[in-house]
Interface confidence: low
């Protein structure tokens, strides 16, 4: 006869490990007992359990409550055992010794590999601001056994760098994602993807990018200067900008205080019926926590009578 086992048994931390040992004997052969021991090099053998055909299972005090027989039905030639709730310290080499009648003793070894799935953590970098150079967006760390793979899934352009720290029974991998912040990245997901043989599927942690910026300011409302004439109602200037965080707006007049009756409503400057005193240089000041911008325009309120007079002069001059 011969013993059937596995070279390597792989189990995830916390799961039960089945240590296989099956005697495939000739007709009429019987298994008297199976002894299991841990036989790591240089440490000698430590008995786990003895499985006796007559007296049943005996477990050593060091493994009390952790070693069991597989659930029935059981084949009397099967000496496999279950090691409950595998921990990292269980990783190593095991030996089963089978005593048979009449063929004698057989032994076989297997290696137990305990996978420690990583528990990844993602740490955002410093606040991202448009105009910065290459900046750390986030770092992702995962420790496991064996060393996990840490990659990034994103549509954002950037560069990655990884480093690994080996510990006695595991390895920690840290990957950093650097980018040049731009406003188009706002709200974009940056996902750390951790792969490991102990995971049924990749673990993913998503960080949403938040980039502070402030666009150049511009003023709308003066597209047709001819509309800015004495008596016109509903004239307004609107300051255009966008930013993150959302900006606030402030209106001033460069050549004096804002005329009475002019209403400031956030990004909009509303005028009462126009008079020549509304002519002047107006400044829109846009700011957020990140930056500030100015845009100025010159308002020239036309006097229609003056204009018609000029036209007459031109005609007469010709």
């Amino acid at each position: 006869g011969e013993l059937e086992t596995s070279d390597v048994v792989t189990v995830v931390l916390g799961q039960d490990a089945k240590l296989p040992c099956f005697y495939r004997g000739d007709s009429g052969e019987q298994v008297g007992q199976v002894a299991w021991a841990r036989v790591d090099a240089g440490e000698g053998a430590q008995e786990l359990a003895l499985l006796h055909s007559k007296y049943g299972l005996h477990v050593s005090p060091a493994y009390e409550g952790r070693v069991e027989q597989p659930p029935p039905p059981r084949n009397p030639l099967d000496g496999s055992v279950l090691l409950r709730n595998a921990v990292q310290a269980d990783e190593g080499e095991y030996e089963c010794r089978v005593s048979t009648f009449p063929a004698g003793s057989f032994q076989a070894r297997l290696r137990l590999r305990v996978l420690v799935p990583p528990l990844p953590s993602l740490n955002p970098g410093p606040a991202l601001e448009e105009g910065q150079g290459l900046t750390l967006a986030a770092s992702c760390t995962a420790e496991g056994s064996p060393a996990p793979s840490v990659t990034w899934d994103t549509e954002v352009k950037g560069t990655t760098s990884s480093r690994s720290f080996k510990h006695s029974r595991s390895a920690a991998v840290t990957s950093e994602f650097h980018l040049v912040p731009s406003r188009s990245m706002n709200g974009q997901p940056l996902t750390c993807v951790v792969s490991h043989p102990g995971l049924l599927q990749d673990q993913r942690i998503t960080h949403i990018l938040h980039v502070s910026f402030l666009a150049e300011a511009s003023v709308r409302g003066l597209e047709d200067q001819n509309l800015w004439h004495i008596g016109r109602e509903g004239a307004m200037l609107k300051c255009l900008s966008e930013g993150q965080p959302p900006p606030s707006y402030n209106w001033t007049r460069l050549d004096g205080p804002l005329p009475s009756g002019v209403r400031v409503d956030g990004d909009t400057l509303g005028f009462p019926p126009l008079t020549t005193e509304h002519s002047g240089i107006y400044v829109c000041h846009v700011s957020n926590e990140f930056s500030s911008r100015d845009s100025q325009v010159t308002v020239d309120v036309l006097d229609p009578q003056e204009d018609s007079g000029k036209q007459v002069d031109l005609v007469s001059a010709s």
Epitope: S121, L122, G187, Q201, R204, T206, H207, H210, P245
Partner: antibody
């Protein structure tokens, strides 16, 4: 033990502002994002935005941009949410909620007890 | 915005029943789906994150499954303390959005 303790109920007039506080204890305040979620009477949950207590960076839902401001005071481990230009449909229970360590961006593992804000003339 | 739709809006069940609540996203959200339980006058409580991961301290009778657009919350054997409103929530992208809720009532 992680705890988020919010300020008491408020009654406000339309057009006014309200500022709700959320004091954190039992963990490192700057290590977890803080979210704000509201719930109108008899209605579902609505996410308003988050603040990163470490940097002060915020992300607001578009619906509330321009009306909401989220701030924090790290010295007293407290987050604040101010909502301006209140309307009657802003009547709701406002919750602060901690983003979890693994999924700080969008999984809320601890919640405050809620603050009822009533907007009525 | 990603719209989350739960069904049913309400259901009546008895203690010991197996209860299933479904949640559908208007677009694929991979496994970025979380479930919360809320009792009247109380704050919501996290049950399941990442579609199927049980939050620490939550009884094992709660389980979650699904990926992409279709997700399920299952209570294997309903207990008296489980009568509440359940919400799904996506954490795939901002704005973070919730389902409208499913109220589980006593039959």
């Amino acid at each position: 033990e992680v705890q988020l303790v919010q300020s008491g109920a408020e009654v406000k007039k339309p057009g006014s502002s309200v500022k709700v506080s959320c004091k954190a204890s039992g963990y490192t305040f700057t290590g977890y994002y803080m979210h704000w979620v509201r719930q109108a009477p008899g209605q579902g949950l609505e996410w308003m935005g988050w603040i990163n207590p470490n940097s002060g960076g915020t992300n607001y839902a578009q619906k509330f941009q321009g009306r909401v401001t989220m701030t924090r005071d790290t010295s007293i481990s407290t987050a604040y949410m101010e909502l301006r230009s209140l309307r009657s449909d802003d009547t709701a229970v406002y919750y602060c909620a901690r983003g979890s360590a693994l999924h700080f961006f969008g999984v809320f593992d601890y919640w405050g007890q809620g603050t009822l804000v009533t907007v009525s003339s | 915005d990603i719209v989350m739709t739960q069904s049913p809006s309400s259901l009546s069940a008895s203690v010991g029943d197996r209860v299933t609540i479904t949640c559908r996203a208007s677009q694929s959200i991979s496994s970025y789906l979380n479930w919360y339980q809320q009792k009247p006058g109380k704050a919501p409580k996290l049950l399941i994150y990442a579609a199927s991961s049980l939050q620490s301290g939550v009884p094992s009778r709660f389980s979650g499954s699904g990926s992409g657009t279709d997700f399920t919350l299952t209570i294997s054997s309903l207990q008296p303390e489980d009568f509440a409103t359940y919400y799904c929530q996506q954490s795939y992208s901002t704005p973070l959005t919730f389902g409208q809720g499913t109220k589980v009532e006593i039959k």
